[in-house]
């Protein structure tokens, strides 16, 4: 679960356990900091909470894929 | 294993303020990614959910509850709680917390403290 | 808010059978519905989550289905040790809701 260093950077030391429903979420932002033991993506949902996840599991990259997808701008 | 535990005082009167704390162990209260709930059950009734706190002090609250509810929380003593004011016999209720990673599924819950509200 | 109205509010059924509750909500909340277990003098215990998944350690004569407004919960093999009231709750919006709960007995 993300662990709040300081106020720009949270560490996940537990991941969520199961896949969240695509369409729940919102953006990600991946943690590199030299705080943090381990790398992590944490998701945002559409009810403003956060959730850590490994990104070494399929469907967080196929989530995080699908989610730049969505942020995108569309090229003229 | 994280666990929780309900405390406060199981008799209140009319118009004071109730105070309930929820000791978090097994873990840290302050890791992210956990969200701190209240939730009641009036008696013989269904489920009432009141609202939240997250480590970061962030909270939400029941907009039916929200004018006199005041969760917070303590990283230094692994707790938080929730403070209702001006209560009446309507409040009377077992008071749960329980906790949600974030998914917005309640999958740790204290054993409850009942709490009546009475002169 | 979204309103969560479960039926039956009571049942009672033999162990062995079949028994099925439903939850229907008052507007489109996709499949963002949990059920919880609660037997005399405990907390919840959820049961599934996202409307058809199975928690962790969880039997699996426990199962549920639905999508948008109807859902259904359903026990395959009724067992003494199921003897306890079941919720539905739902998150598509805060603050969340849950039914009124459907108290199961045994006959």
């Known amino acids: 679960q993300p662990v709040g260093i300081n106020t720009s950077t949270t560490c996940c030391y537990r991941f969520i356990n199961k896949k969240i429903p695509k369409q729940r979420l919102e953006s990600y932002r991946r943690t590199t900091s030299s705080h943090c033991p381990r790398e992590a993506v944490i998701f945002k949902t559409k009810l403003d909470k956060e959730i850590c996840a490994d990104p070494t599991q399929k469907w967080v990259q196929d989530f995080m894929k699908h989610l730049d997808k969505k942020t995108q701008t569309p090229k003229l | 294993q994280v666990q929780l535990q309900e405390s406060g005082p199981g008799l209140v009167k009319p118009s004071q303020t109730l105070s309930l704390t929820c000791t978090v162990s097994?873990?840290?209260?302050?890791?992210?990614?956990?969200?701190w709930n209240w939730i009641r059950q009036h008696p013989g009734k269904g489920l009432e959910w009141i609202g939240y706190?997250?480590?970061?002090?962030?909270?939400y609250y029941n907009p039916s509850l929200k004018s006199r509810i005041t969760i917070s929380i303590d990283t230094s003593k692994n707790q938080f709680s929730l403070t209702l004011s001006s209560v009446t016999a309507a409040d009377t209720a077992v008071y749960y917390c329980?906790?949600?990673?974030?998914?917005?599924?309640?999958?740790?819950w204290g054993q409850g403290t009942m709490v009546t509200v009475s002169s | 808010d979204i309103q969560m109205t479960q039926s039956p509010s009571s049942l009672s059924a033999s162990v062995g059978d079949r028994v099925t509750i439903t939850c229907q909500a008052s507007q489109d909340i996709s499949n963002y519905l949990n059920w919880y277990q609660q037997k005399p003098g405990k907390a919840p215990k959820l049961l599934i989550y996202d409307a058809s998944n199975l928690e962790t350690g969880v039997p699996s004569r426990f199962s549920g289905s639905g999508s948008g407004t109807d859902f259904t919960f359903t026990i395959n093999s009724l067992q003494p040790e199921d003897i306890a009231t079941y919720y539905c709750?739902?998150?598509?919006?805060?603050?969340?809701?849950f039914g009124q709960g459907t108290k199961l007995e045994i006959k």
């Open positions: 329980a906790r949600d990673g974030g998914d917005d599924a309640f999958d740790i």
């Open positions: 097994g873990g840290s209260i302050s890791s992210g990614g956990n969200y």
């Open positions: 709750q739902e998150y598509n919006n805060l603050p969340y809701s």
């Open positions: 706190i997250y480590y970061s002090g962030n909270t």
